[in-house]
Amino acid sequence: GRGEVNLLDTSTIHGDWGWLTYPAHGWDSINEVDESFRPIHTYQVCNVMSPNQNNWLRTNWVPRDGARRVYAEIKFTLRDCNSIPGVLGTCKETFNLHYLESDRDLGASTQESQFLKIDTIAADESFTGADLGVRRLKLNTEVRGVGPLSKRGFYLAFQDIGACLAILSLRIYYKKCPAMVRNLAAFSEAVTGADSSSLVEVRGQCVRHSEERDTPKMYCSAEGEWLVPIGKCVCSAGYEERRDACMACELGFYKSAPGDQLCARCPPHSHSATPAAQTCRCDLSYYRAALDPPSAACTRPPSAPVNLISSVNGTSVTLEWAPPLDPGGRSDITYNAVCRRCPWALSHCEACGSGTRFVPQQTSLAQASLLVANLLAHMNYSFWIEAVNGVSNLSPEPRSAAVVNITTNQAAPSQVVVIRQERAGQTSVSLLWQEPEQPNGIILEYEIKYYEKDKEMQSYSTLKAVTTRATVSGLKPGTRYVFQVRARTSAGCGRFSQAMEVETGKPRPRYDTRT
């Protein structure tokens, strides 16, 4: 069986087993044939007529091989005393099993009195003469444990007390717990303990590319079975468990820490160039911020903000913009404003200086608007709004920015007051409005700001017009939009008009003209 090591197996011996028998006329060494008429060797005794039989059959010396407890598996047939005439007083149906330990082969010089009795063995099934037909002999198998053993070897002996008995085979074996890997710990084979209840503690060694989570231990039972696994090993970073081993993460996969988890596919925009990767390297132009976990996707700096518009009010300017179309895969976007003063031309600009005031602040702006005050009157300014995220400072590329140029003055146009809808289609709306009451100069253009209702913070669009009417196209059918208009002069932009809501036409259903 699995986990059993044979010290003796007579079924593998061809011919006489060479055992010691005494006295004479007791046990006989006899070659028989089995049920299939194959030759087998047996030891038989059938001294059933005389009382007080005491016939001994002793094995050769069996080296212990380190076993503390061994098992004797005896296969035998025993004839029913009732099948033999006239022997009821003298015939027995049991025999005794004994053992003797010694540190060397004692040859023929062993004595009955030295042996220790293991057990009296009876047949589960004896047979009568009627069972002999077609050699249907009832084979009995009995197993007995012997131990604890301490000397280098031992003998087993069968004592016949008057039975009609044939010993067909004897297998002496010890049990061991087989070498195995459990919880990624390798346990070497272990010989079982000295008695039937003992447990032998064995410490496991972590397999290659694994490490202890808790000290791995198991206990080898007397039956040769591993019991009570304690502790375990886990695969190291870069390795995952596969069939009791730790295998390197394949290309394109990684594992950042020791543990039970499997290798994970590299996050988006990253790769592993070698097996057993503990992290995945970011693709070109993608980065991982210092606090990003290895499981986070690699990201890149955002594109420039869009729809940057300015509103000049004397020596102040309000800047508004929409978030970048490409946030770079991150949500931690803030904005920085760069102010440049251009006294002569837009090609010759300089920093605005410390007197300029930014509300709420110049850098790390969370919202997409800014008031810049304390500007010089009648001065050209260039404002750059750059979007920044958690990896912008890791990129060597210059930051993308939206630019707006303005000229300060003392008076921008007043608010456009009257605005009305001229026509609304499914995807377009035509608007009409009046000039501001105080243009404060020549109106250079009008700016129409529009967005889906309640979505101004998410996205809005602008359109420029040079007259007091405009058609806004590319709208969604059946959708409510908000429109605002303002005028721009060389002095800057006026305030936006009050919001006007218009709903685009619903799409007409198609009619099936088939009959």
Epitope: H25, E32, V33, F37, Q44, C46, N47, V48, M49, S50, P51, T77, L78, R79, I84, P85, G86, V87, G89, T90, G129, A130, D131, L132, G133, V134, R135, L137, C164, L165, A166
Partner: antibody, heavy 121, light 106 residues
Framework: QVQLLQSGAEVKKPGASVKVPCKAS????????MSWVRQAPGQGLEWMGW????????TYAQGFTGRFVFSLDTSVSTAYLQISSLKAEDTAVYYC??????????????WGQGTLVTVSS | EIVLTQSPATLSVSPGERATLSCRAS??????LAWYQQKPGQAPRLLIY???TRPTGIPDRFSASGSGTDFTLTISRVEPEDFAVYYC????????FGQGTKVEIK
């Protein structure tokens, strides 16, 4: 070696008695039963019965009761067949044979050389 | 009592040939059957017991089989010393012999 030794030929008159000895050697006499077999001239074998050498208890086959007696003297390892009131049809060779019981079956494994008993007036 | 019938009464074979002897019981004797060989002027010799078991010293050219009521003794290659009379014997509660089969030289 194991052997059974029987006495020489006997010639008896009708009505007389004869006691045929069978001396065993080479084994423990009381460990094996002893059987008796008759073979009339030119005829086959006839089993007469057997005796338990340990208890002395005899078993007789049909047709061999009354005039035939099995007995023992274990001190000299000898079995005896006594036939009384001899008849002419008792003329035969009488064999003693050791009975062997085994796990796999029984048989008469050792035979004496036979004693010819002739009954003639 | 159980009656054993042997056939044939006489079997003529040449040395080296195969000889097959039969023994039939009037009722089942299971495997409680023995075979004996008897040469002229000699005591019988046990050849087989337990229907098929050969005692130590019996040549392996002798083999036997059967159970219940039909039994066979086979001599695979008859040797000159095998010419003799062969008896079967059952050992139930009462023992009986068959009448014998004579194996003679052809």
């Amino acid at each position: 070696q194991v052997q059974l030794l029987q006495s020489g030929a006997e010639v008896k008159k009708p009505g007389a008695s004869v006691k045929v000895p069978c001396k065993a050697s080479g084994y423990t006499f009381t460990s094996r039963a002893m059987s008796w077999v008759r073979q009339a001239p030119g005829q086959g074998l006839e089993w007469m019965g057997w005796i338990n050498t340990n208890t002395g208890n005899p078993t007789y086959a049909q047709g061999f009761t009354g005039r035939f007696v099995f007995s023992l003297d274990t001190s000299v390892s000898t079995a005896y067949l006594q036939i009384s009131s001899l008849k002419a049809e008792d003329t035969a060779v009488y064999y003693c044979a050791r009975v062997r019981f085994t796990v796999y079956g029984d048989g008469m494994d050792v035979w004496g050389q036979g004693t010819l008993v002739t009954v003639s007036s | 009592e159980i009656v054993l019938t042997q056939s044939p009464a006489t079997l003529s074979v040449s040395p080296g040939e195969r000889a097959t002897l039969s023994c039939r019981a009037s009722q089942s004797v299971s495997s409680n059957l023995a075979w004996y060989q008897q040469k002229p002027g000699q005591a019988p010799r046990l050849l087989i017991y337990g229907a098929s078991t050969r005692p130590t010293g019996i040549p392996d050219r002798f083999s036997a089989s059967g159970s219940g009521t039909d039994f066979t003794l086979t001599i695979s290659r008859v040797e000159p010393e095998d010419f003799a009379v062969y008896y079967c014997q059952q050992y139930g509660p009462s023992w009986t012999f068959g009448q014998g089969t004579k194996v003679e030289i052809k």
